[in-house]
Interface confidence: low
């Protein structure tokens, strides 16, 4: 039978040939009568055999990582007979490992993100190296990891390649670190091979910085003419954090006057100081307020970094604006009786300069021929007033600063002209009355009414009477209806057109004013030739014709 031991050949042998071992038949007595042959992949090229002895040689450098074993066939022939001495047999040559491969990090590049200020021991990332050498052959592929760069902030677990934080890091000082990890085989013993990889470790931001004002004092100005809502300036804090951790909210901490507000511009992270109430230079020309700034989002565990909000003091100077005169009242109403003489006192308006310099004021009345105003604001009449022409006057009074004539204010002044009883009542219309020649006594000739141009405080009451002469003539009489009307009645039977065609009756109408006024009003009564029915219609028709120039028969 065949005799051989397990065959091993070390890889990477630099010698031209290397003795692998010997194949032998136990029938071989050493007399060189047997011929050994090698068959199979690698026979003749990688391995040769001494046909006489069966010694096998490797004739080229082997690489276990390329091919770790060769399966060959052996034959032995008796030279003398040409017959096989032993049946052909298969055998194996194993390539034994040497440490000729350094560890390699196959998954690079490595990149990890870890929150800043993470505690010691926080896991960052695991790096893994591979070694092509034989893991079952000694320590050739047993790796140890170590940190070449990254102390004192990082550490690596020697056997697992797990990178952990070993010291607190602040993103605001440095936001990324290149850590260099070395993997050594042979568990780090002499002759070990190594490979390195770089790990980019980025620190993500945590909110470990509170915003701090850039200035401890800001000086701003606001015009006293500024409307509410005006932005009067900006204040700014800085926060070393980034993103939402740097978002901040500004607010008022102290403002006794409650005049200002602060809103946050979330795009620029500035605080905008806003006017909440109008300011008045003459009332208060400077303000001091305190503002504070806080982060918008703060996690509970980071509250220790945000214990006291940063504050700043804001001094606000009010700028004086030359303001127009200010009237004591928004409008004035004065009363004056009609018929008072020219130059009569109506009333006084008063305006002052609200500014500190207190300019004297000049007054004027816009487009009025009836009233005058002096530099003291006293309004007087320039004419006698007649309520029956105008009962109210709407004036526009203008106040102008003497020191700056562009500073003008105007207000309305209403003057009511009060009534005095200066008009007697009179017929409300022109009356033409007619009486038939054959009229009987007590016949109603005309109903009359009166009007009075005066204003009545209560109700007008008119008193109707015939004049003394007419009362005595007794052709007609009057009855006062007590409702501001009266009726004229005949006081006799029969009238004569030829003798007395027209009567002129004087009617006295008195009012109830104090003193009472009386007017004399003439009522014309025409005597008519009437038909039997006593109608004055034809009489009226005749009058109409006569007035038009026609004669009736």
């Amino acid at each position: 039978g065949w005799v051989w031991n397990q065959f091993f050949v070390p890889e990477e042998m630099n010698t031209t040939s290397h003795h692998v071992g010997r194949l032998r038949s136990d029938l071989d007595n050493g007399n060189n009568s047997f011929q050994y042959k090698l068959l199979g992949a690698g026979a003749g090229s990688t391995f040769i055999i001494d046909e006489r002895t069966g010694d096998i040689y490797a004739i080229e450098k082997l690489d276990r990582e390329e091919r770790s074993l060769y399966i060959l066939r052996a034959q032995v022939i008796d030279i003398t007979t040409g017959r096989a001495v032993e049946p052909e047999s298969e055998f194996v040559i194993k390539v034994s490992d040497i440490n000729d491969n350094e560890p390699k990090f196959l998954d690079e590049p490595y990149e990890a993100i870890v929150p800043e200020m993470s505690p010691e021991g926080t896991l960052v990332i695991q790096v893994t190296a591979s070694d092509a050498d034989d893991p079952s052959s000694g320590n050739n592929a047993r790796l140890l990891y170590s940190l070449l760069q990254g102390q004192p902030y990082f550490s690596v677990e020697p056997t697992t390649g797990v990178i952990r934080i070993s010291s607190k890091m602040d993103r605001e000082l440095q936001d990324e670190y290149w850590v260099i990890i070395q993997a050594k085989d042979m568990i780090g013993q002499p002759g070990a091979l190594s490979g390195t990889t770089s790990v980019l470790i980025k620190l993500s931001d945590v909110n470990d910085n509170k915003p701090i004002f850039k200035e401890s004092l800001y000086r701003l100005t606001v015009s006293e003419s500024a409307p509410t809502g005006t932005s009067i300036g900006t204040i700014m804090a800085y926060d070393n954090d980034i993103g939402e951790n740097a978002e901040m909210d500004y607010s008022i901490e102290e403002d006794d006057s409650q005049t200002f507000d602060i809103i946050t511009n979330h795009e620029t992270q500035e605080g905008i100081v806003i006017l909440k109430k109008k300011v008045n230079f003459e009332h208060q020309n400077h303000y001091g307020i305190r503002a504070k700034v806080k982060n918008h989002h703060v996690d509970k565990q980071l509250m220790k970094y945000h214990t006291e909000a940063s504050t700043t003091f804001i001094k606000i100077q009010v700028e004086d604006v030359d303001e127009p005169p200010l009237f004591l009242l928004p409008y004035y109403i004065f009363e004056i009786f009609e018929e008072t003489p020219q130059g009569s006192f109506v009333g006084v308006v008063s305006a002052t300069d609200p500014d500190n310099r207190k300019s004297p004021i000049r007054y004027s009345i816009t487009r009025s021929k009836v009233f005058n105003i002096d530099d003291n604001g006293t309004i007087t009449t320039t004419n006698s007033l007649d309520r029956e022409i105008s009962a109210w006057y709407n004036l526009s009074i203008t106040a102008t600063e003497k020191y700056n004539i562009e500073q003008i204010s105007s207000i309305p002044v209403y003057v009511q002209v009060l009534n005095i009883n200066d008009h007697a009542p009179e017929f409300s219309q022109y009356y033409e009355s007619y009486v038939c020649e054959n009229a009987g006594s007590g016949q109603v000739i005309q109903t009359i009414s009166a009007v009075d141009r005066d204003e009545s405080i209560e109700e007008h009451h008119f008193y109707f009477n015939l004049s003394v002469e007419d009362t005595n003539s007794s052709s007609f009489t009057i009855i006062d209806n007590q409702d501001n009307t009266a009726v004229i009645l005949t006081n006799r039977t029969g009238f004569n057109l030829q003798e007395e065609p027209i009567f002129y009756i004087s009617i006295l109408i008195a009012d109830n004013g104090i003193p009472s006024l009386t007017s004399t009003n003439t009522l014309t009564i025409h005597v008519c030739d009437c038909d039997d029915s006593g109608s004055t219609q034809t009489c009226q028709y005749q009058e109409l014709m006569l007035s038009m120039g026609f004669k009736t028969e």
């Epitope: 505690p119 010691e120 102390q151 004192p152 010291s167 607190k168 602040d170 605001e172 000082l173 701090i212 004002f213 850039k214 200035e215 401890s216 804090a237 800085y238 070393n240 220790k304 214990t307 006291e308 940063s310 700043t312």
Partner: antibody, heavy 120, light 111 residues
Framework: QVQLVQSGAEVKKPGASVKVSCKAS????????MSWVRQAPGQGLEWMGI????????TYAQKFQGRVTMTGDTSTSTVYMELSSLRSEDTAVYYC?????????????WGQGTLVTVSS | HSVLTQSPSASGTPGQRVTISCSGS????????VNWYQQLPGTAPKLLIY???QRPSGVPDRFSGSKSGTSASLAISGLQSEDEADYYC???????????FGGGTKLTVLG
């Protein structure tokens, strides 16, 4: 080279206040914290408090709370430390020391020191 | 007493190596950077080591710092007579929200 120049020696009576100044130059004054550290005769170093000159943010040691006030003037790059209600045990050399951009980063430059003597 | 504990004194002969220790707690050394200051007689303190083991430029490499857990140490090798000074450790304390100094160690160079 960074310089921190402190004001001169002071002699004060018990109950009084003292204000020590520290003028900084040759660096960006508003970027770094400034601490005050004192050293009583023959004793060790004692931290009093810290100020960020930009915004005037302060943190004081518990021991000095209520008695110490630290302020900064960005226009003159000067920080001030005022200690009130002085007592004899406040006799010490007072140092200003520049910190980092974080409260917890080391002091790399120190002022020359100001001797404050409290004596009746 | 100080929050950070330092031995009051240390000594060594020229050329020797001496170590000064500083002991604290989780809220200070355990979670923050340790700094060392040297104060020569009659002068202001000077930064010697920062961030546990970093040396400012100008500080000889004879000085080294290290930190482990809640303790830190300053090592001076090749001791020289000009190293005679007070040495202070200092660290930010998260609980106290302030800086704390060790009580200081007086280093004497003998002979």
């Amino acid at each position: 080279q960074v310089q921190l120049v402190q004001s001169g020696a002071e002699v004060k009576k018990p109950g009084a206040s003292v204000k020590v100044s520290c003028k900084a130059s040759r660096y960006t004054f508003t970027s770094y914290y400034m601490s005050w550290v004192r050293q009583a005769p023959g004793q060790g170093l004692e931290w009093m408090g810290i100020i960020h000159p930009s915004g005037g943010d302060t943190t004081y040691a518990q021991k000095f709370q209520g008695r110490v006030t630290m302020t900064g003037d960005t226009s003159t790059s000067t920080v001030y430390m005022e200690l009130s209600s002085l007592r004899s045990e406040d006799t010490a050399v007072y140092y200003c020391a520049r910190g980092g951009i974080k409260l917890w980063l080391h002091f790399d430059y120190w002022g020359q020191g100001t001797l404050v003597t409290v004596s009746s | 007493h100080s929050v950070l504990t330092q031995s009051p004194s240390a000594s060594g002969t020229p050329g020797q190596r001496v170590t000064i220790s500083c002991s604290g707690s989780r809220s200070n050394i355990g979670s923050n950077f340790v700094n060392w200051y040297q104060q020569l007689p009659g002068t202001a303190p000077k930064l010697l080591i920062y961030t546990n083991n970093q040396r400012p430029s100008g500080v000889p490499d004879r000085f080294s710092g290290s930190k482990s857990g809640t303790s830190a140490s300053l090592a001076i090798s090749g001791l020289q007579s000009e190293d005679e000074a007070d040495y202070y450790c200092a660290v930010w304390d998260d609980s106290l929200n302030g800086w704390v100094f060790g009580g200081g160690t007086k280093l004497t160079v003998l002979g």
